[in-house]
Structure formats: C-alpha cells, structure tokens
C-alpha cells in the first residue's frame, strides 16, 4: 500500500511540477523592470523567453515576439532549449508513469514491467526537473550579470535591443515558478524511483521449489525479475511460486490487496 501511495504521490507531484514548467516557459515575466531607481515610471517593461512586453499605466499592454533567431543571445537560446527538453522529457515521463501506476491494470502487465516503467519515468522526471532548474538558474545568472552592466547602449534586454536609457531588469515571477516547478518535478521523480524499489520483486521473496518430474528430479531455481532496462518482459523466464512452477505465459493475473487504492 505504501508503494502505491508513494508512486501515486510521485506521479501527482511530477504532474504539478511539469504543469508549472510549462507555465513558466510560456510566461512573459521572466525578467521585470527594476523600479528601485525609478519607482514613478508610467511605463513598465517585462520580458519572457518568447516576447517582450510593455504595460502602460493606462492599462494598455503591448507585446512583441522575438522574431529573430540569430539575433538573440546564445544564453537565451540555451534557456529555451533546456526548458523545452524539460517539458518533452516530463511529458514522456508522465505518459510512461500512467501505465506504470500500480493502481491501473493493463492486461497482464507484471509488477516487474511496472517497476521498470516507474524507474524510467522517475529518471525522466529527475532530468526534466534538473533541466528546468538549470534553465531558470542560467537566466537568473544572466539577469544578475546584466543588472550590473546595464549602462547606455548596452544589450540588457533579452531581445537584444540597444538602449539609450538605463533600464535594469530583475527576477520575474516566472523564475520562481520555474524553480518551484523544477523542484517538484525532481521530488516527484525521486519518489517514483523509491516506489520502483518497492515494486520490483526481490529474489528473497521466492523459495527454491523442487519439481518432481517422472523418472528424474529437476530443481528449478528462482528467476525473479529485478528492475532492469527496457519495458518488455522475458516470457521464457520461469518464475517459481510456492504453488508450483509455471511459465510466465501461463500465469494469470489476479487482483491482490495492493492492486487498488
């Protein structure tokens, strides 16, 4: 039951985290105009990964996309790449983890296969979270560097426009969303990996059973699965249970007390 709970919680935490990573990536407030030196401005600037915006005090907001690709700073491109990789890995991880959930039965999928899938999705979530944290941290570092270098005619904005007025940018809401979301995805991934250990059958769980065939005696030793690479199961391996020896093809899947939450 604890394994199912850990796996389920890991899935939910990762789901929230990946939703947060997507939200952060789409948000426009990665950097916002620092108002410390000019708190009385009637125009407020903020920038995202994809566009920069200007909000006038009168309520009008105008956003312009970064339509150039080559003209953008390499660091911005790197941050975009990290966030997209994080989202893609997270999305694949979510897809895999849905099928790996112990509370969901798909045909006669073995716990060993679910363990493999759980581990795979956990690793994907961890990498996804790390990508998001790395992306946000790179951007934050870029902001800190630019903050102290924001003098006239210097590239301070992400759009690479020349400024004639000192406009400093500080951390926007998206950075905090990204950090928290990346952290959640990472935690969710770790929980999935922990759940995987509980799902994988241990060798000590199975006793060696003597199967008395007519004429001569053959001892079958256990071949229980451990978490291994790949999703597929080796159908030729034999699992020996107290109730007798059967090939995996013959084993029927019955609900156990752990199958439902």
């Amino acid at each position: 039951m604890a394994v199912t709970a850990c796996q389920g919680l890991g899935f939910v935490v990762s789901l929230i985290g990946i939703a947060g990573i997507i939200a952060a990536t789409c948000m426009d407030q990665w950097s916002t105009q620092d108002l410390y030196n000019n708190p009385v401005t009637a125009v407020f600037n903020y920038q995202g990964l994809w566009r920069s915006c200007v909000r006038e005090s009168s309520g009008f907001t105008e956003c312009r996309g970064y339509f150039t690709l080559l003209g953008l700073p390499a660091m911005l491109q790197a941050v975009r790449a990290l966030m997209i990789v994080g989202i893609v890995l997270g999305a694949i991880g979510l897809l895999v983890s849905i099928f790996a959930l112990k509370c969901i039965r798909i045909g006669s999928m073995e716990d060993s296969a679910k363990a493999n899938m759980t581990l795979t999705s956990g690793i994907m979530f961890i990498v996804s979270g790390l990508c998001a944290i790395a992306g946000v941290s790179v951007f934050a570092n870029m902001l800190v560097t630019n903050f102290w270098m924001s003098t006239a005619n210097m590239y301070t904005g992400m759009g690479g426009m020349v400024q004639t007025v000192q406009t400093r940018y500080t951390f926007g809401a998206a950075l905090f969303v990204g950090w928290v979301a990346g952290g959640l995805t990472l935690i969710g991934g770790v929980m999935m990996c922990i759940a995987c250990r509980g799902l994988a059958p241990e060798e000590t769980n199975y006793k060696a059973v003597s199967y008395h065939a007519s004429g001569h005696s053959v001892a079958y030793k256990p071949g229980g699965f451990k978490a291994s690479t790949g999703f597929g199961s080796n159908t030729k391996n034999k699992k020996i249970y107290d109730g007798g020896a059967r090939t995996e093809d013959e084993v029927q899947s019955y609900p156990s007390k752990h199958d439902y939450v």
Partner: antibody, heavy 117, light 113 residues
Framework: QVQLQESGPGLVKPSETLSLTCTVS????????VSWIRQPPGKGLEWIGV???????NYHSTLISRVTISVDTSKNQFSLKLSSVTAADTAVYYC???????????WGQGTLVTVSS | DIVMTQSPDSLAVSLGERATINCKSS????????????LTWYQQKPGQPPKLLIY???TRESGVPDRFSGSGSGTDFTLTISSLQAEDVAVYYC?????????FGGGTKLEIK
C-alpha cells in the same frame, strides 16, 4: 460615446477643501485611468494626479500632501479633493481619460473654481 | 520631476506655411522595452479643453488631419504643421507621459502672420 463632465462648487473659501466630481460614460472605469488637470486663468496646464483602472493613484509631487483622488464605480464617478486651498488654486479643473500611450484622449469641458473669501 | 521646455513661447506663421514647435525634456522619454517615446502633443483653442493630437511622439490620434506630424526621440521633440490653416490657431502643449508626475510644457501660442 465617451463623455466626461466635471461638477462642483465654483467658489471655495481659503483653507477649505475643494471637492470636484467627474461623471463619466461610454467606457469602463476599471479599464482606463482618469487624470485631473488644472489651468489657472491665462496660464498653462498643470497635471494634478491620476487614478488608474486598478484603483492605484499617482499625484503631482507639489500637491501630494493635499490631494486625494478616488472612484465610485457604482455611480461612474471620480472625485478630486484638494485640502487647504489658497488663491493660487484658482483654476479651471479638467478631468480626462488616459488612453494608449498614457495620453489624455478625452477631456471634460472643465469647471472654474475660484478660491476667495 | 521631468521638466518640459517648449520653444518658442509664441509663433506667427503665414497661412499655408510650415509651423514648427519644439519641446525638450530634462530626461529621456524613450522606453527601451518598445522603443517608443512617451511624449504627447495637445492643441487647445480658446475657451475649449485641450485636444489630443499626437501620442508616442509621432502617432497621430484618429481624426487628426495629416498636416500634423510629430518627430524626435529621447529628449528633443518637434510638432510640425505642414501647411497652416486658420483653424490651427491655438496653444500647443507637449506632455511627458513616461514618468510621474506627467508634466506639461509651458505651451506655444500659434498665431497667423
């Protein structure tokens, strides 16, 4: 269509509080800001302050201690209160809507307020 | 506070001639985020409230004749009337719309020569 109309007493005694109302129609009070501007007789325009659609306000630094701008959305009205008035506060008072570029795109006709005992 | 200085104080131009009014701000009105100058021009005829002519230094308000044009960037701005008409006689004001307080220039009185 967008309309703004100022109203209030035409005569205020020195040291008293000047209270004016700007009744608006044709636009959402939560989507636009409204500025108050005054013009002493024969002189130029002086910006007093503004209340934005979100309820935040900004005032001229020289008047900040005496001025209050507020909104009553149920009545579609903005109000200006200027305390401790002197003869120097005698002017035509205008309210105007702040539009794109923070520019004042629609103005009321103005109301003359004289400060005299 | 940003100080707006207009020149000349008064200007007399013949009908059909070009009229040029200058406005200088003590600080730049150029916003780096959208590369727009937050300077506005108004026209005020006697006994009337001001009328918006140009915002963002060069964008004409709808309904304003195309003989009115605005130019300039940073701290120096110009309002140009390409061919003066009788109805253009008025006082013209520039305003800083970039930083509070949203100060006005002293005004330029335009007359017919």
């Amino acid at each position: 269509q967008v309309q703004l109309q100022e109203s209030g007493p035409g005569l205020v005694k020195p040291s008293e509080t000047l209270s004016l109302t700007c009744t608006v129609s044709g636009f959402s009070l939560t989507s636009y800001g409204v500025s108050w501007i005054r013009q002493p007789p024969g002189k130029g325009l002086e910006w007093i302050g503004v209340i934005w659609g979100d309820g935040s306000t900004n005032y001229h630094s020289t008047l900040i201690s005496r001025v209050t701008i507020s909104v009553d959305t149920s009545k579609n009205q903005f109000s200006l209160k200027l305390s401790s008035v002197t003869a120097a506060d005698t002017a035509v008072y205008y309210c105007a809507r702040a539009g794109r570029g923070n520019a004042l795109d629609y103005w009321g006709q103005g109301t003359l307020v004289t400060v005299s005992s | 506070d940003i100080v707006m200085t207009q020149s000349p104080d008064s200007l007399a131009v013949s009908l059909g001639e070009r009229a040029t009014i200058n406005c200088k701000s003590s600080q730049s009105l150029l916003n780096s985020g959208n590369q727009k100058n937050y300077l506005t021009w108004y026209q005020q005829k006697p006994g009337q409230p001001p009328k918006l002519l140009i915002y963002w230094a060069s964008t004409r308000e709808s309904g304003v004749p195309d003989r009115f044009s605005g130019s300039g960037s940073g701290t120096d701005f110009t309002l140009t009337i390409s061919s003066l008409q009788a109805e253009d006689v008025a006082v013209y004001y520039c305003q800083n719309d970039y930083s509070f307080p949203l100060t006005f220039g002293g005004g330029t009185k335009l007359e017919i020569k």
